[in-house]
Amino acid sequence: AGVFELQIHSFGPGPGPGAPRSPCSARLPCRLFFRVCLKPGLSEEAAESPCALGAALSARGPVYTEQPGAPAPDLPLPDGLLQVPFRDAWPGTFSFIIETWREELGDQIGGPAWSLLARVAGRRRLAAGGPWARDIQRAGAWELRFSYRARCEPPAVGTACTRLCRPRSAPSRCGPGLRPCAPLEDECEAPLVCRAGCSPEHGFCEQPGECRCLEGWTGPLCTVPVSTSSCLSPRGPSSATTGCLVPGPGPCDGNPCANGGSCSETPRSFECTCPRGFYGLRCEVSGVTCADGPCFNGGLCVGGADPDSAYICHCPPGFQGSNCEKRVDRCSLQPCRNGGLCLDLGHALRCRCRAGFAGPRCEHDLDDCAGRACANGGTCVEGGGAHRCSCALGFGGRDCRERADPCAARPCAHGGRCYAHFSGLVCACAPGYMGARCEFPVHPDGASALPAAPPGLRPGDPQRYL
């Protein structure tokens, strides 16, 4: 048994550009708190999988209000350590998740609102009893600096907290075969009292009263050798004549896993897969209770009154996850109109509107033509939230204030010459072409590509473009 301890040193903007905005403001003061989740081994499990080694919540930090115009500093932290007690052996390798939560203290309907600011995760090797290990983790633009250690609770000692120590019976030396307990030299290592009759050569125990067998041995006291010859049954005890295993009780018989845990056999013994909220060799330990307030965002905690019963969070509408820590993505329904950007603030949806649109859902098309005149007889046209002027002939530009040169775009084809005219432009076509823009070739036999020339016009005449 022992305790994992976590000390948060700082939480603030990381180095480099793009400093994050302060999570708190004068209008919405807030305070931080932290959650740590520990899992044995080097698993890369999802954040929602059980914290099989345990979990802890920090106290709330001091209330913080952003100073207008100031960059986000390191934020004020809660006092004290986060402590995660473990009942069994310390695994040596572990995975951690550290979450930074913000509690908003504004005028929230139904009490304060919580939101996850940052989550960091890692996998580490750590011997119990060692010095503090320092770490820096980054989550987006945020940086978290912390230290951690695992220490054994007396009488346990050792890198896994599995050796037990007792005060010396004699002042000078320990009993036969027992070593002094470093660093507590005035104490002696105490032998674990295994089940009576457990083979000292082929059996061992991690808890008092048990007898676990080394590979190759079986039976309640680990006195029966496992035969390697072909046998009908995979487990013993052995028949005296053949040395083969005959059907007998297996380690999972009777399901040693408590609290709904499922048992699977391992080469040495058995392993329990525990339901959420429980851990330990036999799922007998619950690290988090309803008293720890594990349900966020107004979730209702049910059960989990004591460490031996699981808790369940009943989430309010719009929240999900085993601790109600995740928000349902309401923006995926795209409630903002006219290309507005949807923001889910938890207590409300907000739309950031494109230029030319307004309203809670960007539903109002601003009248861009109001108070805007187009010069020289132009008319204002609304469209896409931006106004434009449809200009009278001979004028151009955003507000029709510029005189247009109708010949600037070289509208006359096939070498035709362009002349500006009060009503537009006139093309004088090169020989062999005709039409308003000189676009039609005249055929050699005198016929044109036009179905019929308008009366009074001969091929080659300047064509007025109206």
């Epitope: 309401r330 329904l333 795209q334 409630p335 949806l349 859902r361």
Partner: nanobody, 119 residues
Framework: EVQLVESGGGEVQPGGSLRLSCAAS????????IGWYRQPPGKQRDMVAG???????TYAESVKGRFTISRDNAKNTVYLQMSSLRAEDTAVYYC?????????????WGQGTLVTVKP
């Protein structure tokens, strides 16, 4: 206050079809966006299909070509026609709506209806 009431859930075999309905009721409201979310056992709640604020239909990739959303504005009802159902479509299906009441917008959820797809 607006109530969303779902119906039409049930058990169906793989390849089968179901039609879910969501009826919105209340006083003096107008629907801005409305659609369907689903939450499989032990997983998170995600959007399946809906009418956006602009009135355009939107679908999750996993249901495109199999599910069709429609609406009856006169009845303030939205429907989800589900075809070629698969085991992974098993979930509680929730109706959700972004609703304008007076000058404010509010989000509402229905209680959900269970759809089970199994042989």
């Amino acid at each position: 206050e607006v109530q969303l009431v779902e119906s039409g859930g049930g058990e169906v075999q793989p390849g089968g079809s179901l039609r879910l309905s969501c009826a919105a009721s209340g006083s003096d409201f107008s629907i801005n966006a409305i659609g369907w979310y689903r939450q499989p056992p032990g997983k998170q709640r995600d959007m399946v299909a809906g009418f956006t604020g602009d009135g355009v239909t939107t679908y999750a990739e996993s249901v495109k070509g199999r599910f069709t959303i429609s609406r009856d504005n006169a009845k303030n009802t939205v429907y989800l026609q589900m075809s070629s159902l698969r085991a992974e479509d098993t979930a509680v299906y929730y109706c959700a709506a972004d609703v304008k009441i007076g000058g404010d917008y509010e989000w509402f959820w229905g209680q959900g209806t269970l759809v089970t797809v199994k042989p």
